[in-house]
Interface confidence: low
């Protein structure tokens, strides 16, 4: 909320954009205020919260030759590689004078296919011996479903039907392969394929 | 996390001066202002003034412009009001607190009650 | 300088009740720009700090139950509980920020 002496017009004239997308996406949010007298330090909050390492950079340009005439100044948050932890409401922040302002926020939005938080391992088992493999993954959007393959061969009849996060197995008498797909609204990951190695009796 | 602490009281004289503490902790000091309120007891809420560290700039609620200093120390980031001419009147609890910025959690101190008697 | 006043100074309800308060500002609180009312609403209950409600005349601040509502315009203001529950005992204040701060005198709640 301002601070000062009295509350003046906002002097955002450019407020941040929305991304949404992928993990891993790079994206830049924009800022643009005019300002009277010497530019101030932008500042980016996501969630209410200043962003201390955040990886901006701010330009700045005078309208005019007087140090009391206006400026322009920009200020360009880039986000590297898009994670979850980088999701949220951003907005810039400028103190001026006794006052702080922010902007209208924007939304960073994170959105794909499903990504794996664990994957099926490699494992040697002995033979008719019972095992289990674990696979767990995450949108958004969510609901992720899951489906577990045998040897390419699909162990439920769709998606989000028959085992999810844990497969029991109750034995092999050969040496096999598993993997797991992920379906969300966006589309399917594939899991690594595990080899599991039955021992010869 | 973030944290304001202030010392639980002080004792002083009539017509002493004293100066109240408030360390700043689990954020970047410099950029949120730090507000003063006065409570006396069974009362209400009394904004004193603000200072913004990282320039030191201040506003005062007219009522206490003689009566108190907010000052801050950067590389111990602590805020600081003093008093001085102390009178009973100004027995009280004060408390700090960090400035928020929409939705961002505010913080208060626990307030430091002073009490000023002889 | 911006006067708060508030209504009623004291108030005595039983559990599960509805309770409205008032504050009203000397001077409208609304920036026509940035299209923020800066009128917050603080909890204080006995023996510890105040705590922030409501923030922009409406907007619950992270955490705070949904039973309390704040609402108004310009220079009315009303925190409405829905609901009161024992643990809502507490003063009330409401604070303007529109120009530096001031306290209204604040409400205290009173559970029967």
């Known amino acids: 909320a301002p601070r000062g002496t009295q509350a003046e017009e906002s002097p955002f004239v450019g407020n941040p954009g929305n991304i949404t997308g992928a993990r891993g996406l790079t994206g830049t949010l924009r800022c643009q205020l005019q300002v009277q007298g010497e530019p101030p330090e932008v500042h980016w909050l996501r969630d209410g919260q200043i962003l201390e390492l955040a990886d901006s950079t701010q330009t700045q340009v005078p309208l005019g030759e007087d140090e009391q005439d206006d400026w322009i100044v920009v200020s360009q948050l880039r986000i590297t590689s898009l994670q979850l932890s980088d999701t949220g409401q951003y907005q810039c922040l400028v103190f001026l004078g006794h006052q702080t302002f922010v902007s209208q926020p924007g939304y960073v939005g994170l959105e794909g296919l499903p990504y794996f938080l664990e994957e099926p391992e490699d494992r040697t088992v002995a033979a008719n011996t019972p095992f289990n493999l674990s696979c767990q993954a995450q949108g958004p959007p969510e609901p992720v479903d899951l489906l577990w393959l045998q040897d390419a061969v699909p162990l439920a009849t769709a998606p989000g039907h028959g085992p999810q996060r844990s497969l029991h197995v109750p034995g092999l008498n050969k040496t096999s392969s598993f993997s797991c797909e992920a379906h969300n609204a966006k589309g399917v990951t594939t899991s690594r394929t595990a080899t599991i190695t039955v021992l010869p009796q | 996390q973030v944290q304001l602490q202030q010392p639980g009281a002080e004792l002083v004289k009539p017509g002493a001066s004293v100066k109240l503490s408030c360390k700043a902790s689990?954020?970047?000091?410099?950029?949120?202002?730090i507000n003063w309120v006065k409570q006396r007891p069974g009362q209400g809420l009394e904004w004193i003034g603000n200072?913004?560290?990282?320039?030191?700039?201040?506003n005062y609620n007219e009522k206490f412009k003689s009566k108190a200093t907010l000052t801050v120390d950067k590389s111990s980031t602590t805020a600081y009001i003093q008093f001085s001419s102390l009178t009973s009147e100004d027995s009280a609890v004060y408390y700090c607190?960090?400035?928020?910025?929409?939705?961002?959690?505010?913080?208060w101190g626990q307030g430091t009650t002073l009490t000023v008697s002889s | 300088d911006i006067v708060m006043s508030q209504s009623p100074s004291s108030l005595a309800v039983s559990a599960g009740e509805k309770v409205t308060m008032s504050c009203k500002s000397s001077?409208?609180?609304?920036?026509?720009?940035?299209?923020?009312?800066?009128l917050a609403w603080y909890q204080q209950k006995p023996g510890q700090s105040p705590k922030l409600l409501i923030y922009?005349?409406?907007t619950r601040q992270s955490g705070v139950p949904d039973r309390f509502t704040g609402s108004g315009s310009g220079t009315d203001f009303t925190l409405t509980i829905s609901s009161v529950q024992a643990e809502d005992l507490a003063v009330y204040y409401c604070?303007?920020?529109?120009?530096?701060?001031?306290f209204g005198g604040g409400t205290k709640l009173e559970i029967k």
């Open positions: 607190t960090r400035d928020t910025y929409g939705g961002s959690p505010d913080y």
């Open positions: 689990g954020y970047t000091f410099t950029s949120y202002w």
């Open positions: 200072i913004y560290p990282d320039s030191s700039s201040t």
């Open positions: 001077q409208s609180l609304l920036n026509s720009r940035t299209r923020k009312i800066y």
């Open positions: 922009w005349a409406s």
């Open positions: 604070k303007q920020s529109y120009n530096l701060w001031t």
